[in-house]
Amino acid sequence: STGASSHCQKTSLRVNFEDIGWDSWIIAPKEYDAYECKGGCFFPLADDVTPTKHAIVQTLVHLKFPTKVGKACCVPTKLSPISILYKDDMGVPTLKYHYEGMSVAECGCR
Amino acid sequence: STGASSHCQKTSLRVNFEDIGWDSWIIAPKEYDAYECKGGCFFPLADDVTPTKHAIVQTLVHLKFPTKVGKACCVPTKLSPISILYKDDMGVPTLKYHYEGMSVAECGCR
């Protein structure tokens, strides 16, 4: 680490379903990119992190009282679905085209 | 600190508009409770932190590779408006009953 944290952004996060114990029911894919929101929410909050008014307020309070209040947090603000092949309760391989909320589409400061 | 962070929850955060430089345009109230989302998003994520599938996946990956991936973050998931009195461009004190997104209503793990 350089010591300077980068600003809030979407980064790759390859997830192997075997690593998290979901390979018992998800047949395919074996892995996917969940992405991750990484980096700091620094003052001034840029438009690209789509800050809420509360995030702006919290950032300003943190600036004034850094030990009392934390910074806003870099989190997923929009998620995307992935397609999965899974075994249904009859053991039949079934395709779910839109398995919602599995991958980060956008990150922001909240 | 006890060393054990509490779980993700809403806590009081009194904000004085003078402290953040907004007293130049917000006349009243002088301060309000913005609330703050504080605490950790620990495995297993409880229902009350309304985790997304992505947050659950990230939590599981963090459990397996704690140095590679961060925990999900405790953030506002629902915001409430406050009422403010401000001076418009004619110098007329004007009430905005619903100044949106200023106060935390609910926290969750994202």
């Epitope: - | 006349i27 009243a28 109230p29 002088k30 301060e31 309000y32 406050i82 009422s83 403010i84 009195l85 418009d88 004619m90 110098g91 007329v92 004190p93 004007t94 009430l95 009953y97």
Partner: antibody
């Protein structure tokens, strides 16, 4: 700058009606509520009611509700206050004033003296 | 309706003295953390002038010697150093609810 110019003094007989006008300039007429306040000689201020020029919605003081009518003509940025069935104790200076939804009366007209005498 | 009671009825002070005018409401004028209390100055033969709003904020062009304070039901208008031109009647007004009501006024005289 904001200006509220009211119509001239009136002398009326008891039982008659009076209509006072208030011509606004220097701001967007539909932006603020127009209030009417009266002041009897040597007395305090008495709020009569308010009208929203944008949609014409009104709030009247119960005391005047049966006798007062507030209207606007947006095309000429003018507000009107009509008081009917006049009595001698309606003798007063009538003011128009503007304020926002907060209700503070920021700008005032010069006042119109209405004298009710037989 | 909300009744506003002003005191004293008359205040007679010398130039440079501090004037303290009181206004008491029959119920709280606070809502949303905002005090719906306003003060006006009226000189003889003139329309009222907007002095203080939301209990403690000065209207445009009002000299710094005029200040307001209070919350709930008890409010104060203070003139820190009276000037001869401050001779006037001062009215409080609540804008919390309809009917908007005024206090009976305090007459400030300069000795």
């Amino acid at each position: 700058q904001v200006q509220l110019v009211q119509s001239g003094a009136e002398v009326k007989k008891p039982g008659a009606s009076v209509k006072v006008s208030c011509k606004a300039s220097g701001y967007t007429f539909t932006r603020y509520w127009m209030h009417w306040v009266r002041q009897a000689p040597g007395q305090g201020l008495e709020w009569m009611g308010e009208i929203n020029p944008s949609q014409g919605g009104t709030n009247y003081n119960e005391k005047f509700k049966s006798r007062v009518t507030m209207t606007v003509d947006k095309s000429i940025s003018t507000a009107y206050m009509e008081l009917s069935r006049l009595r001698s104790d309606d003798t007063a200076v009538y003011y128009c004033a503007i304020g926002s939804n907060y209700g503070g009366l920021v700008y005032w007209g010069q006042g119109t003296l209405v004298t009710v005498s037989s | 309706e909300i009744v506003l009671t002003q005191s004293p009825a008359t205040l007679s002070l010398s130039p440079g003295e501090r004037a303290t005018l009181s206004c008491r409401a029959s119920e709280s004028l606070d809502n949303y953390g905002i005090s719906f209390m306003n003060w006006f100055q009226q000189k003889p033969g003139q329309a009222p002038r907007f002095l203080i709003y939301a209990a403690s904020n000065q209207g445009s062009g009002i000299p710094a010697r005029f200040s307001g304070s209070g919350s709930g039901t008890d409010f104060t208008l203070t003139i820190s150093s009276l000037q001869p031109e401050d001779t006037a009647v001062y009215f409080c007004q609540q804008s919390k609810e309809v009917p908007r009501t005024f206090g009976g006024g305090t007459k400030v005289e300069i000795k």
